[in-house]
Amino acid sequence: SSSLEVLFQGPGLNDIFEAQKIEWHEENLYFQGEPAVYFKEQFLDGDGWTSRWIEKHKSDFGKFVLSSGKFYGDEEKDKGLQTSQDARFYALSASFEPFSNKGQTLVVQFTVKHEQNIDCGGGYVKLFPNSLDQTDMHGDSEYNIMFGPDICGPGTKKVHVIFNYKGKNVLINKDIRCKDDEFTHLYTLIVRPDNTYEVKIDNSQVESGSLEDDWDFLPPKKIKDPDASKPEDWDERAKIDDPTDSKPEDWDKPEHIPDPDAKKPEDWDEEMDGEWEPPVIQNPEYKGEWKPRQIDNPDYKGTWIHPEIDNPEYSPDPSIYAYDNFGVLGLDLWQVKSGTIFDNFLITNDEAYAEEFGNETWGVTKAAEKQMKDKQDEEQRTRRMMRTKMRMRRMRRTRRKMRRKMSPARPRTSCREACLQGWTEA
């Protein structure tokens, strides 16, 4: 059977009413029934994925291959889409039965493995409406949600969470750090109908909060009053010069004075050398520039704070979270160094189901994956050590040969002669 699974909204409304699992929130009716699995892809049917995923028609774009990589926990289960060509754009997408997340939770989940020790490349997915032309998906194609890790140079190691709100891509105001090692990691985005969200990595929460607080979807609630301006007599000086203070009469002394101890040299010739002038020295009585004493300003009013008013442009939106139509999941990426593997895609309305699915896929193979990698690393270390030893041995042998060549030739004697010689000497 195909490993792509598409189901519909779960049970009918009657079942849900009977089960009394109804919750109200800000005029949105939402429910928890049976989990709806809108999209699931584990690449368990060999080349079957090629009929479900559509590539952009452009010759210079990178190719995805099905692979479990250089190390894995389970060679079959860990097969996923791997980027295979360096310094390329990638564009691949799969469609599913269109759905809306209005009135219900949305969960987007997948695994990413940057086994190439990535320097710059995306590991994120985009969720598009079903109006997307999959053969022409590109960086500017309008999407609903973009989610997942992105690494580029030392400055970017983040999880993007971007929502298209009223035609604009709005970036999260928080910095969520992604994993940058070579192992498989599970990324989960949960968007709830109460306009809250949660981001999980490896089934552990790394960020959560409210959509309105953590994105700039709406204008600010308060703005500076455009009709207010600082009064002209507003005094912001905390200290002022003391008007009663005056400069002492003996204050002004020159900074430098002629050295009173200096004497004209005896051989000084005024006709030849000109008029003798004593060298100048720092005046010990010089007091510098006089500044009046500072006192508290009796008219000080503090720093003027621009008064704020309610922003007439602000109005709350209880349906920020909601999209009318999801129909395509796409990988629209750039990778400098290829080798990333994407697997275990899931779009559902059930948080618990997603967590369970994560534990049954990523959770089951992660330890064995690490073991295989550690074993490979150990073998590599051993090989490296062996190579180093061999190299050292070769170098010693070469040195010995060189020494032999350089040393003066000795007359050859038979073993017997040499031994006898030794005995006699002893």
Epitope: D119, G139, D140, D150, P154, G155, T156, K168, V336
Partner: antibody
Framework: EVQLVQSGAEVKKPGSSVKVSCKAS????????ISWVRQAPGQGLEWMGG????????NYAQKFQGRVTITADESTSTAYMELSSLRSEDTAVYYC????????????????????WGQGTTVTVSS | SYVLTQPPSVSAAPGKTARISCGGN??????VHWYQQKAGQAPVLVIY???KRPSGIPERFSGSNSGNTATLTISGTQAMDEADYYC?????????FGGGTKLTVLG
Amino acid sequence: EVQLVQSGAEVKKPGSSVKVSCKASGGTFSSYAISWVRQAPGQGLEWMGGIIPIFGTANYAQKFQGRVTITADESTSTAYMELSSLRSEDTAVYYCASSPLRGSGWYWHYYYGMDVWGQGTTVTVSS
Amino acid sequence: SYVLTQPPSVSAAPGKTARISCGGNNIRSKSVHWYQQKAGQAPVLVIYQDSKRPSGIPERFSGSNSGNTATLTISGTQAMDEADYYCQAWDSNTVVFGGGTKLTVLG
């Protein structure tokens, strides 16, 4: 924070080419995208194109396509802009400007604006 | 190609609020940045992503973006704010600048 220092003023004949350099210091060159923007006397700002050194690929404004080449040398942390077939209308101050690279897509750094600018290089095209 | 339209000039009295508009078709779907350029100097980024202020930019600078107009607001305008101001957006793999607005601080 990165600083950008551009090469000196140039006087060129119509039909010739000019190559302006922009050396970055005080930051990791591969963490930025570099744009080239010009400003003719008394006129506004005009974007010519940009490059992401870590990608090694450049993109250009339609108007300059085929006449401008933007390159980057990571070993010297220097970006270059070469404009060929010069005409008198190309007389302008040419600026390089950097945007922090906040992701692996072409569009990422354009979400953040050009936050550091070079001092500008005056190019005069005159016969 | 995408066009950003700015008024050639705007004036404000010291301490008052100055507003500079930047019009573009459905501009609210774009991320708009604003630059200040004083005579003989390179531009300086004063607002990015519609309304965010880079560090070192005074609080009196703010930005908004809705419908077909993005706006740079300078509240409590000071003489030192006299400069040219440019809006900028990104469209179809291209950076687009507005034509620029000269802000004159009166008196």
